[in-house]
Amino acid sequence: QSGPLPKPSLQALPSSLVPLEKPVTLRCQGPPGVDLYRLEKLSSSRYQDQAVLFIPAMKRSLAGRYRCSYQNGSLWSLPSDQLELVATGVFAKPSLSAQPGPAVSSGGDVTLQCQTRYGFDQFALYKEGDPAPYKNPERWYRASFPIITVTAAHSGTYRCYSFSSRDPYLWSAPSDPLELVVTGTSVTPSRLPTEPPSPVAEFSEATAELTVSFTNEVFTTETSRSITASPKESDSPAGPARQYYTKGN
């Protein structure tokens, strides 16, 4: 063996966004024949020497960052990428609206606005079926997610969450769904958005930081965070993954 053992993967099934009191399973997957797995919760002394962490009912205290590694003989692997386990439903749901409206012509512009009655400074928007979330720090209890030059691929069901940067793994319940309808096109690009939105004066600081990635990572000008919605595994009690967008840091 030359060099360190390759890192394992760490998944949350059915999703890394877990409503309070609902079950979730964290699964560490290394190569065949691993001697020992270690799964740990970062920023705590909590760990276990097995590949699977079963959480029958999600609690606030279980939200946070997790990683795992494995041992073969006397060698330890590199750690897995961190998995951010988020408890949702901790706070009341925000409201999501579309300006000027949820029906938009292809090529037009629309802005999705997430609004909460709490003084949260963080918002997350997701579209069902997409690979990563937008996260958005805001000062005015409302986040704007402009979509410039709308295409058919932007059609779909959106929801948003609100939360505080002080407790970044404790999120609100999801907003009621907003159905965005794009009219006047028959071409459906395979990825979306087709370009990052351009800054809008009212929210220039936040929107300028938006970069959409089609991996499981979301990059901003300041930090990189990974919020992973786990894919389905056929032999697991998991369901179809819901993927998320975040914006900002």
Partner: antibody, heavy 119, light 107 residues
Framework: VTLKESGPGILQPSQTLSLTCSFS??????????VGWIRQPSGKGLEWLAH???????YYNTALKSRLTISKDTSNNQVFLKIASVDTADTATYYC????????????WGQGTTLTVSS | DIQMTQSPASLSASVGETVTITCRAS??????LAWYQQKQGKSPHLLVY???NLADGVPSRFSGSGSGTQFSLKINSLQPEDFGSYYC?????????FGGGTKLEIK
């Protein structure tokens, strides 16, 4: 894996029902294992009552929570359920069953014990 | 609480036929669903776990499908021992609830 329920058979209204589930072939100290209680009035459907996990976390049927208490004796391979202040609506067959986290299912069931509440 | 709606409530079929029983959850339960068979006077018996996985010893003529809110149990080429009652149950957060049951009778 086997489970067997035992209970009083007959109770009068307002009495407390004490049920015992004795099991073999698995341990309730094993990670991811639980035992649950389910009941079925004659000719009717199944109703989940409560369950307890290996780590002593307990969950109860919302409508009956104030009357239910589940507990375990890991060393003797037993799980207990108490139902306070029974009435005729509690007349049913009571089952215990093993829960395994991976399958998220009740994978082994006892034969059941029948309770009749009558004055 | 999550409600499980099972249909039909009763079903008559002949040996050799194929039947399908459905179960609908009132909200997304991913694949946290099990199916059980119960014969008269006996305790329930696990058939399918995690919506699609056959329990040990269950004949391959049984199959489970679905995820999210819509699920089904299919029995191909019914055998005499298949007649009885069938129940679905969700495990996606307590309270765990059962469907109302489907009574499968010989035609």
């Amino acid at each position: 894996v086997t489970l067997k329920e035992s209970g009083p058979g007959i109770l009068q209204p307002s009495q407390t029902l004490s049920l015992t589930c004795s099991f073999s072939g698995f341990s309730l100290s094993t990670y991811g294992i639980g035992v649950g209680w389910i009941r079925q009035p004659s000719g009717k459907g199944l109703e989940w009552l409560a369950h307890i996990w290996w780590d002593d976390n307990k969950y109860y049927n919302t409508a009956l929570k104030s009357r239910l208490t589940i507990s375990k004796d890991t060393s003797n391979n037993q799980v207990f359920l108490k139902i306070a202040s029974v009435d005729t609506a509690d007349t049913a067959t009571y089952y215990c069953a093993r829960i395994h986290y991976y399958g998220s299912s009740l994978d082994y069931w006892g034969q059941g014990t029948t309770l009749t509440v009558s004055s | 609480d999550i409600q499980m709606t099972q249909s039909p409530a009763s079903l008559s079929a002949s040996v050799g036929e194929t039947v399908t029983i459905t179960c609908r959850a009132s909200e997304n339960i991913y694949s946290y669903l099990a199916w059980y068979q119960q014969k008269q006077g006996k305790s329930p018996h696990l058939l399918v776990y995690a919506a699609t996985n056959l329990a040990d010893g269950v004949p391959s003529r049984f199959s489970g499908s679905g995820s999210g809110t819509q699920f089904s149990l299919k029995i191909n080429s019914l055998q005499p021992e298949d007649f009885g009652s069938y129940y679905c149950q969700h495990f996606y957060g307590t309270p765990w609830t059962f469907g109302g049951g489907t009574k499968l009778e010989i035609k």
